[in-house]
């Protein structure tokens, strides 16, 4: 058993049929010594008396808010949550496996630049009685500070018969060094509580591996005289790290016909312009990637040819 | 060429070679679906690699003030990785294919380190890996980790030379 926060405790249980459970001793936070009784949740049934209460925690029915009273007055509360371990593996019932980029990916994170700011998100089908708390650091043995905000519900989607809820959180490394080569990964820890079930999820990454620039901005076409060719130009996204002579991007320019089956013409360039042939009803798209490190490409920025 | 005394390197040549190094480092080990091996026992060989850290003057401001600190750091790293790529981690079994990009990568690391430090000039070369022989069973994992680490190192070096070529070239 360990304390998650004031008056909230997590009981770690090996979860299998007829498991013996964990013996837990609760102590009433009071100077009083006698006349103390204990109840669980809203029930008025007295579970025991005295300053301490010993219980055997085996299942969710044994978890909940234990309250000690004296003469009708509440003295203190202890909320017990359960953390299940099945076959040596902690349960992951609350969050959905996003399976990208690999199985057992519950948290996904992205950064738009090297400033030390990043966003993580996760999915669940649970809509009520759900709380999250997020902590992060750079490295684990001698952790350096990363500050995370509160997790918020960022999207709701319908997937078949189910509703899916996306939560996200923004974090910022306290003393980020954008130009340095990271040697210690960022660690992100999410505590999830659904009713009386506790679970924790972690992710470990370097900012360089989760970089995904915003799409190029101000995508423009300039027809070239007496030619089917056009000059496409664009700019670095505002959110990208500066100076651009140091934090450089490379670009992919694609000409795509109306039909998905049509052959795509692609050009790769380090410049912020390119000359391509504009086919009727086609569109021109440009995306960006870090020039020197193969992290994710941005989403496409597109304009129609006409 | 970067002379320890402080004259400028051939920024444009260094930029071209460092960008080639980035390409080679990724073709030698493309990132296959984030094969995440950080949790798999960190061997000394990959713990001891020199990193370009915050105080090494490799940021745009530091380069403007005095690029020598940064160039020396990059030089040390190039020598370190060049030695690693020549060690039995890469020359032993399981054999690399004769046309593996690791050979070109190895040669380019040497080429860039020589551009930074012509013969006859000597920066003290810290952190030469003292490598005890590796076992074949360790090598695939070690290669993976070294190449991943090298990708990060050469990315920073390439940014330095690109910025230098754009803003510090005479």
């Amino acid at each position: 058993i360990w304390e998650l926060k004031k008056d909230v405790y997590v009981v770690e249980l090996d979860w299998y049929p007829d498991a013996p459970g964990e013996m837990v001793v609760l102590t009433c936070d009071t100077p009083e010594e006698d006349g103390i009784t204990w109840t669980l949740d809203q029930s008025s049934e007295v579970l025991g008396s005295g300053k301490t209460l010993t219980i055997q925690v085996k299942e969710f029915g044994d978890a909940g808010q234990y309250t000690c009273h004296k003469g009708g007055e509440v003295l203190s509360h202890s909320l017990l949550l359960l953390h299940k371990k099945e076959d040596g593996i902690w349960s992951t019932d609350i969050l959905k496996d996003q399976k990208e980029p690999k199985n057992k990916t519950f948290l996904r994170c992205e950064a738009k630049n090297y400033s030390g700011r990043f966003t993580c998100w996760w999915l669940t089908t649970i809509s009520t009685d759900l709380t999250f708390s997020v902590k992060s650091s750079r490295g684990s043995s001698d952790p350096q500070g990363v500050t995370c905000g509160a997790a918020t519900l960022s999207a709701e989607r319908v997937r078949g018969d189910n509703k899916e809820y996306e939560y996200s959180v923004e974090c910022q490394e306290d003393s980020a060094c954008p130009a340095a080569e990271e040697s210690l990964p960022i660690e992100v820890m999410v505590d999830a509580v659904h009713k009386l079930k506790y679970e924790n999820y972690t992710s470990s990454f370097f900012i360089r591996d989760i970089i995904k620039p915003d799409p190029p901005k101000n995508l423009q076409l300039k027809p070239l005289k007496n030619s089917r060719q056009v000059e496409v130009s664009w700019e670095y996204p505002d959110t990208w790290s500066t100076p651009h002579s140091y934090f450089s991007l490379t670009f992919c320019v694609q000409v795509q016909g109306k039909s998905k089956r049509e052959k795509k013409d692609r050009v790769f360039t380090d410049k912020t312009s390119a000359t391509v042939i504009c086919r009727k009803n086609a569109s021109i798209s440009v995306r960006a990637q870090d020039r020197y490190y193969s992290s994710s490409w941005s989403e496409w920025a597109s304009v129609p040819c006409s | 060429r970067a002379v320890p005394g402080g004259s400028s390197p051939a920024w444009t040549q260094c930029q071209q070679l460092s960008q080639k190094l980035c390409t080679l480092a990724w073709s030698a080990h493309p990132l296959v679906g984030h094969m995440d091996l950080r949790e798999e026992g960190d061997e000394e060989t990959t713990n001891d690699v020199p990193h370009i850290q915050c105080g090494d003057g490799c940021d745009p401001q530091g380069l403007r003030d005095n690029s020598q600190f940064c160039l020396q750091r990059i030089h040390q790293g190039l020598i370190f990785y060049e030695k690693l790529l020549g060690s039995d981690i890469f020359t032993g079994e399981p054999s690399l294919l004769p046309d593996s990009p690791v050979g070109q990568l190895h040669a380019s690391l040497l080429g860039l380190s020589q551009l930074l430090q012509p013969e006859g000039h000597h920066w003290e070369t810290q952190q030469i890996p003292s490598l005890s022989p590796s076992q074949p069973w360790q090598r695939l994992l070690l290669r993976f980790k070294i190449l991943r680490s090298l990708q990060a190192f050469v990315a920073v070096a390439a940014r330095v030379f690109a910025h230098g070529a754009a803003t510090l070239s005479p």
Partner: antibody, heavy 115, light 107 residues
Framework: EVQLQQSGPELVKPGASVKMSCKAS????????MHWVKQKPGQGLDWIGY????????NYNEKFKGKATLTSDKSSSTAYMELSSLTSEDSAVYYC????????WGQGTTLTVSS | DIQMTQSPASLSASVGETVTITCRAS??????LTWYQQKQGKSPQLLVY???TLADGVPSRFSGSGSGTQFSLKINSLQPEDFGSYYC?????????FGSGTKLEIK
Amino acid sequence: EVQLQQSGPELVKPGASVKMSCKASGYTFTSYVMHWVKQKPGQGLDWIGYINPYNDGTNYNEKFKGKATLTSDKSSSTAYMELSSLTSEDSAVYYCTSNWDRGYWGQGTTLTVSS
Amino acid sequence: DIQMTQSPASLSASVGETVTITCRASGNIHNYLTWYQQKQGKSPQLLVYNAKTLADGVPSRFSGSGSGTQFSLKINSLQPEDFGSYYCQHFWSTPFTFGSGTKLEIK
């Protein structure tokens, strides 16, 4: 075509030393380690050790430490093995071979130790 | 150290027959195993590496299998040139050791 050309047969007296060579061609000599293997007449194969010609790093079978010394010369793409304090037990064919999974072997050097 | 136990020590077979040679490692060597053929007075020739990958130029009647501690080399439809000695060898860790060999003779 990859070739490992070993030096010719040796007849030496007990207590003496001998140095045999293995010249590599057809590949970049410093790209692969070079192993040495001993085979006594009518018997099996015994690994002696390897040298990495790139940095002259060596790895010996405990059994052959103090007996065999491996060296190499990058300029001539040649690996060497010196055997010291020879006895009749050292009479054997000695092979050099590049990485096991590449399958390149020298033709062998026959060493006879006899008074 | 990992020991390689090879069997049988010798084997007589006729042209056209199929034979199997086995090799057992004293520890898990995954697939870090090679098979060699050696003719009298000649250098060993690589047949199979990584337990089951046929070396260049090796006829498809040869096949390697196994992983972990149990391995085998199978020769289908024996040809006259297949007679000689066969060795397995691990390259999982030093010291690299060879099996004691299997002498394949014509019946």
